[in-house]
């Protein structure tokens, strides 16, 4: 009755700070327009990282944001936040809206758990 | 703050047309479909139909198929409702709202009579 | 017009608790979500309860609802003086190809 979303429990950023992971929905079939947001939980607080409508027909890449990238394929979205700092270390929540046509469906993922780990500054050198 | 404004009921003959406009505001217009919900006098809300975030494609319930024209200006953030051959079983207040139904606007009155 | 069918009233004192109900069919309730919407006299609906089950933004955990077989029921707990308002229910048809929607129930508060 519900829609469920998966993604992969824990994500390692690379030393750029660079995280991707795949959010997997269970597609009713007919949708047209999916909306993918990401939301970023920090205690009980959600805050929305980025969001995009897209047109599954396209397989596009779909966010268009200075955070977040993206491209789709079927009922899969690859999703890639850039410019993550050691303090963005934190549950990042794959958020799936049917958007048309109807029926209207949501459906969220538990999270991924983004660990990044601040570069080392490099010696200085004479 | 998301905010939809309908504008444009009024008294119409039957066989008449009128014009509904919804004006949005407080959130990305233009990624999100829309419906447009009617509630008659002492009676409970009915999907009049809906349009996809691009203007491409839309939908409509069987009561006003061939009747209805839902369309949408993004540049302007509005959706439309064109009613042609109204009726009296028309009369209702006017909704529109988000395709995910988070946010409704305040409603228009259209009465359809002689 | 209403698929759905719900008590046209209910009434109750405040802080008491009050449920409504909302009976459909195997096409709707029994297949599909219900939504809850709360409509302020002259105003338009607003959505209490998500298509996932889940409290819309900004409403009280008052506010909760449950489903058995074909019938979704709305419980609002310790009854408050802005509660009194109409209460919709919606579902999808998977017959009729759309979202049907309750006659709508009227909360009185004593």
């Known amino acids: 009755k519900g829609m469920h979303a998966a993604q992969p429990a824990v994500v390692l950023a690379s030393s750029r700070g660079v995280a991707s992971f795949v959010c997997e929905y269970g597609s009713s079939g007919n949708a047209a327009e999916v909306r993918v947001t990401m939301l970023r939980q920090a205690g009980s607080q959600m805050t929305e990282v980025c969001a995009a409508t897209y047109t599954v027909e396209d397989e596009l890449a779909f966010l268009d944001d200075s955070t977040c990238t993206g491209t789709s394929s079927g009922n899969k979205v690859n999703l890639t936040i850039q410019g993550l700092r050691a303090m963005g270390t934190g549950l990042y929540i794959c958020k799936v809206e049917l958007m048309y046509p109807p029926p209207y469906y949501v459906g969220m993922g538990n999270g991924t758990q983004i660990y990044v780990i601040d570069p080392e500054p490099c010696p200085d050198s004479d | 703050e998301v905010q939809l404004v309908e504008t444009g009921g009024d008294l119409v003959k039957p066989g008449g047309s009128l014009r509904l406009s919804c004006v949005a505001s407080?959130?990305?217009?233009?990624?999100?479909?829309m419906n447009w919900v009617r509630q008659a006098p002492e009676k409970g809300l009915q999907l009049v139909g809906g349009?996809?975030?691009?203007?491409?494609?839309?939908y409509y319930t069987d009561a006003v198929k061939g009747r209805f024209t839902i369309s949408r200006d993004n540049a302007k953030n509005t959706v439309y409702l064109q009613m042609n051959s109204l009726r009296a079983e028309d009369t209702a207040v006017y909704y529109c709202?988000?395709?995910?139904?988070?946010?409704w606007g305040q409603g228009t009155l259209v009465t359809v009579s002689s | 017009q209403a698929v759905l069918n719900q008590p046209a009233s209910v009434s109750g004192s405040l802080g008491q608790r009050v449920t409504i109900s909302c009976t459909g069919s195997?096409?709707?309730?029994?297949?599909?979500?219900v939504a809850w919407y709360q409509q302020l006299p002259g105003t338009g609906p607003r959505t209490l309860i998500n298509?996932?089950?889940n409290r819309a933004s900004g409403v009280p955990d008052r506010f909760s609802v449950s489903r058995s077989g074909n019938t979704a029921t709305l419980t609002i707990s310790g009854l408050q003086a802005e509660d009194e308002a109409d209460y919709h229910c919606s579902s999808w048809d998977w017959s009729l190809h759309t979202y049907v929607f309750g006659s709508g129930t009227q909360l009185t508060i004593l």
């Open positions: 709202a988000i395709s995910n139904w988070a946010y």
């Open positions: 349009i996809n975030s691009g203007g491409s494609s839309t």
């Open positions: 407080g959130f990305s217009f233009s990624s999100y479909a």
């Open positions: 298509v996932d089950g």
């Open positions: 195997s096409s709707d309730i029994g297949k599909s979500y």
